[in-house]
C-alpha cells in the first residue's frame, strides 16, 4: 500500500508510517514500527507532559520559590504543571507568576475599588464628591462624608476627598 502522507488525530508521521502519540503524562521512548506500537513511559516524580506528544523528555514542574514570595496553589501531576500563587499581601508580576510584589496601597484621597488577589494588584479609585479616604490602605474603600443633618448638626468644615466633614452645633437664633 501507498505510505501515508497524513495521519489521524493523536498520531504522527515518521518514516512514512503513522505512529500513535504518547498520552498526557507519558514521554516517547521509541517510535512505532510496522510490528511494534509506539513505546511510551510515564513521566517521573516532579515531571509532566500536558498534551498528546512525541516528546522524549518530560517537563519539570514549576518551582514556587518562597524567596520570591511564591507558594504552591495547586500541586502538579504527571499531566499538569504546578500552579504558583503569592503569599498573603503579595501578587504575581505576570500571568506566569514567576515572582511576586507587595500589594499596592491606595493613597489618601483614593479608595480600594478591588482588593488584590494572589494574581492581581489592588485597584484604586479616586474618592468622588461626598466620599473620602484619609489613610494609605490596601483594603479601605472611600468612606461617605458624615451626614451632619442626621445628627442635628451643621457642617462647620467642608469635607474633601481626603478629609471628612466637620460637624458642629447649629447656631441658636438670639431672641
Amino acid at each position: 500500500p501507498e505510505p501515508p502522507t497524513a495521519c489521524r488525530e493523536k498520531q504522527y508521521l515518521i518514516n512514512s508510517q503513522c505512529c500513535s502519540l504518547c498520552q498526557p503524562g507519558q514521554k516517547l521512548v521509541s517510535d512505532c514500527t510496522e510490528f511494534t506500537e509506539t513505546e511510551c513511559l510515564p513521566c517521573g516524580e516532579s515531571e509532566f507532559l500536558d498534551t498528546w506528544n512525541r516528546e522524549t523528555h518530560c517537563h519539570q514542574h514549576k518551582y514556587c520559590d518562597p524567596n520570591l514570595g511564591l507558594r504552591v496553589q495547586q500541586k502538579g501531576t504527571s499531566e499538569t504543571d504546578t500552579i504558583c500563587t503569592c503569599e498573603e499581601g503579595w501578587h504575581c508580576t505576570s500571568e506566569a507568576c514567576e515572582s511576586c510584589v507587595l500589594h499596592r496601597s491606595c493613597s489618601p484621597g483614593f479608595g480600594v475599588k478591588q482588593i488584590a488577589t494572589g494574581v492581581s494588584d489592588t485597584i484604586c479609585e479616586p474618592c468622588p464628591v461626598g466620599f473620602f479616604s484619609n489613610v494609605s490602605s490596601a483594603f479601605e474603600k472611600c468612606h461617605p462624608w458624615t451626614s451632619c443633618e442626621t445628627k442635628d448638626l451643621v457642617v462647620q468644615q467642608a469635607g474633601t476627598n481626603k478629609t471628612d466633614v466637620v460637624c458642629g452645633p447649629q447656631d441658636r437664633l438670639r431672641a
Partner: antibody
Framework: QVQLVESGGGVVQPGRSLRLSCAAS????????MHWVRQAPGKGLEWVAV????????YYADSVKGRFTISRDNSKNTLYLQMNSLRAEDTAVYYC??????????WGQGTMVTVSS | EIVLTQSPGTLSLSPGERATLSCRAS???????LAWYQQKPGQAPRLLIY???SRATGIPDRFSGSGSGTDFTLTISRLEPEDFAVYYC??????????FGGGTKVEIK
C-alpha cells in the same frame, strides 16, 4: 524484570517437526513485534522471522519460507516458531528478540535445535 | 536484499587500545535503522548502538557509532577486558530480510 525465555529445542531427525516457544515477562508483550534469529554453530547471526504485535504482519527469511510458521498468543505472553520439514542446515541456537525502532533491544538466552539422523 | 560486509574479520588488540570496526552496505541504508550488537561466547547478543550513533541503555560511553549511507563504523575508544567479543552490525530499514553483517571478532593480542 524484562525477560525472554526460549524452550522446545532438542535433537530431531531431518524431515521432522519441532515447535519452539518464547515466554515473555516484565513488559507489555501485546505491544511489541517479536523476531526469531538463529545462529549455526561457529557462524554468525541469521534473521529468521518476525511477527507484529497484533499478528497481522509476518515475514520470513527465504531459507525458511513455507516450512516455518511464526505465531503468538498475547493472552499467554508467548511467541512460537513451528518448524516443519527440518533440514541439517537448520541446526542452530534459536533466539527470540523484541522488536523496537531501536533494533532488537531484548534477547532470550537461546534454545539449541539439532537436526541429525 | 541489503548485504552488510564487516571488516576486518578479526581484530587483534591489547586492552587500552582503540578498536575501529567497519560495516559496509551493498546499498544505502537509513542511518535511523542501523544497529550494532555485541556477543560473548555462550551468550545472547546485546544491543549496543541503534540509529547508527545512539548508545542503548546502560552502554558505556567508550562505545560510539558513526556513519551514513553505505559506510558505518563502531569505535571502542579504550578496550576493556570485557569488550573482547564478536560484534555484528544489522540493518532494519529495508526488509524482509532484516540482515546482519558477518561479524568482527575482537580478540586479545
Amino acid at each position: 524484570q524484562v525477560q525472554l525465555v526460549e524452550s522446545g529445542g532438542g535433537v530431531v531427525q531431518p524431515g521432522r517437526s519441532l515447535r519452539l516457544s518464547c515466554a515473555a515477562s516484565g513488559f507489555t508483550f501485546s505491544s511489541y513485534g517479536m523476531h526469531w534469529v538463529r545462529q549455526a554453530p561457529g557462524k554468525g547471526l541469521e534473521w529468521v522471522a518476525v511477527i507484529s504485535y497484533h499478528a497481522s504482519s509476518k515475514y520470513y527469511a527465504d531459507s525458511v519460507k513455507g516450512r516455518f510458521t511464526i505465531s503468538r498468543d498475547n493472552s499467554k505472553n508467548t511467541l512460537y516458531l513451528q518448524m516443519n520439514s527440518l533440514r541439517a542446515e537448520d541446526t542452530a541456537v534459536y533466539y527470540c528478540a523484541r522488536d523496537t525502532s531501536r533494533g532488537h533491544d531484548i534477547w532470550g538466552q537461546g534454545t539449541m535445535v539439532t537436526v541429525s539422523s | 536484499e541489503i548485504v552488510l560486509t564487516q571488516s576486518p574479520g578479526t581484530l587483534s588488540l591489547s586492552p587500552g587500545e582503540r578498536a575501529t570496526l567497519s560495516c559496509r552496505a551493498s546499498q544505502s541504508v537509513s542511518s535511523s535503522y542501523l544497529a550494532w550488537y555485541q556477543q560473548k561466547p555462550g551468550q545472547a547478543p546485546r544491543l549496543l548502538i541503534y540509529g547508527a550513533s545512539s548508545r542503548a541503555t546502560g552502554i558505556p560511553d567508550r562505545f560510539s557509532g558513526s556513519g551514513s549511507g553505505t559506510d558505518f563504523t563502531l569505535t571502542i575508544s579504550r578496550l576493556e577486558p570485557e569488550d573482547f567479543a564478536v560484534y555484528y552490525c544489522q540493518q532494519y530499514a529495508d526488509y524482509p530480510p532484516f540482515t546482519f553483517g558477518g561479524g568482527t571478532k575482537v580478540e586479545i593480542k
